[in-house]
């Protein structure tokens, strides 16, 4: 004959566990029955009455089967950088990660605690790495015969475009400048380069920034929270 | 190049205020520029920055009071209102030194000498 | 909020002597810290980027180090040039902070 299934409350056997979705009352020194998610313990099992479980209150939650007397309060509402990715629920907490164009700086368990914009790189410097949700852009200065003449989030550093006959000759921040009506080639895949002004190549053209007072040892900041590594300021 | 602040004086509280920074042989189109203050005898306090591309950026205790905007190719100004004498310091106006590339670091590389603005009644 | 705390002031050294400053930051801030030292009526002066790069034209006796929370500004040789007040600033978070300076050290040479 089948094993007769216990009900709670029930004194369990020496030296056996509770079952699923119960739990030992050391005061009754019973198994009892855990709430269900979105409940919490209103009233704590005896030897002769169960758990009574109620739902737990607006702005609180529970996301375990448990036995706690109240539920857990949802975070803050969240920030003004930041999206709600998941509402408070009576059997969740609220999440919150940033808006596009941000990243997390500082996060926590669940969601994020700080963001910060993505940095943009300047003119003279692309993107070594692009921002993450949990970490910032990370820039590196244009190698010779590249450029970029943004400042950005997103752009990398894009080569000069070849000339049959050089007017200006590119540098970090600027293309080149044929004095052709086109270029003979370019090395940028897929890129459509204007015959001049190079103006029309972006809205964002910059005469090549003046030196700042800043040293010439390049030094890259660091991608979230990791450690700068050193590079030049191409100011 | 050089940074000038100007537009500091005497005020009463309630009174609204603009300083404003000049900027010579500085790109404000390829520079930020930040807003830091020092209360007399006190240490120095981060209001806030606009990048190059315009952003805006304040420190928790600056936002709604402060505005920074830039005016011309080679002034920022800083808006200050409801104005009370805990905001009696020198104002500084300083240009962020642009490391690794970046637009901006929140680290200052060249300073003004700074605008004295007293708040009394 | 991320706040940046300094030692304590003043701090004495003598000519020639080694002063060292603490910074501590409440969160990691990986490397980006700033020193400054500033004299009684003049705006601050950026002696040390990224921890540890020393500013252009800033003598070598100045020096950084320190990454994630701790940091430290060491000047070795003190020189009577040197008194002053000297600030950490972080760098790594720039929106919702109360402020990014440490409160200072004053440093005394006798």
């Known amino acids: 004959l089948p094993a007769q299934v216990a009900f709670t409350p029930y004194a369990p056997e020496p030296g056996s566990t509770c079952r699923l979705r119960e739990y030992y009352d050391q005061t009754a020194q019973m198994c009892c029955s855990k709430c269900s998610p979105g409940q919490h313990a209103k009233v704590f099992c005896t030897k002769t009455s169960d758990t009574v479980c109620d739902s737990c209150e607006d702005s609180t939650y529970t996301q375990l089967w448990n036995w706690v007397p109240e539920c857990l309060s949802c975070g803050s509402r969240c920030s003004s950088d930041q999206v709600e990715t998941q509402a408070c629920t009576r059997e969740q907490n609220r999440i919150c990660t940033c808006r596009p164009g941000w990243y997390c700086a500082l996060s926590k368990q669940e969601g994020c605690r700080l963001c910060a914009p993505l940095r943009k790189c300047r003119p003279g410097f692309g993107v070594a790495r692009p921002g993450t949700e949990t970490s910032d852009v990370v820039c590196k200065p244009c190698a010779p015969g590249t450029f970029s003449n943004t400042t950005s989030s997103t752009d990398i550093c894009r080569p000069h475009q070849i000339c049959n006959v050089v007017a200006i000759p590119g540098n970090a921040s600027m293309d080149a400048v044929c004095t052709s009506t086109s270029p003979t080639r370019s090395m940028a895949p897929g890129a459509v380069h204007l015959p001049q002004p190079v103006s029309t190549r972006s809205q964002h053209t910059q005469p090549t920034p003046e030196p700042s007072t800043a040293p010439s040892t390049s030094f890259l900041l660091p991608m979230g929270p990791s450690p700068p590594a050193e590079g030049s300021t191409g100011d | 190049q050089s940074v000038e602040e100007s537009g500091g004086r005497l005020v009463t509280p309630g009174t609204p205020l603009t300083l404003t920074c000049t900027v010579s042989g500085i790109d404000l189109s390829s520079y930020t520029m930040g807003w830091v203050r020092q209360a007399p005898g006190k240490g120095l306090e981060y209001i806030g920055f606009?990048?190059?591309?315009?952003?805006t950026y304040y420190a928790n205790w600056a936002k709604g009071r402060f505005t920074i905007s830039k005016t011309s190719s080679t002034t920022v100004d800083l808006k200050m209102t409801s104005l009370t004498t805990e905001d009696t310091a020198t104002y500084f106006c300083?240009?962020?030194?642009?490391?690794?590339?970046?637009?901006?670091?929140?680290?200052?590389?060249?300073w003004g000498q700074g605008t004295l603005v007293t708040v009394s009644s | 909020d991320i706040v940046m705390t300094q030692t304590a002031s003043p701090v004495s050294a003598a000519v020639g002597g080694t002063v060292t400053i603490k910074c501590q930051a409440t969160e990691s801030i990986s490397s980006w810290l700033a020193w400054y030292q500033q004299k009684p009526g003049q705006p601050p002066k950026l002696l040390i980027y990224g921890a540890s790069t020393l500013e252009s034209g800033v003598p070598s006796r100045f020096s950084g180090s320190g990454s994630g929370t701790e940091f430290t500004l060491t000047i070795s040789g003190v020189q009577c040039d040197d008194a002053a007040t000297y600030y950490c600033?972080?760098?790594?978070?720039?929106?919702?902070?109360?402020?990014?300076f440490g409160g200072g050290t004053e440093v005394v040479v006798k």
């Open positions: 606009i990048s190059s591309s315009g952003h």
């Open positions: 600033q972080q760098g790594y978070i720039y929106t919702n902070v109360d402020n990014t």
């Open positions: 300083a240009r962020d030194g642009g490391y690794g590339g970046y637009d901006y670091t929140g680290i200052f590389n060249l």
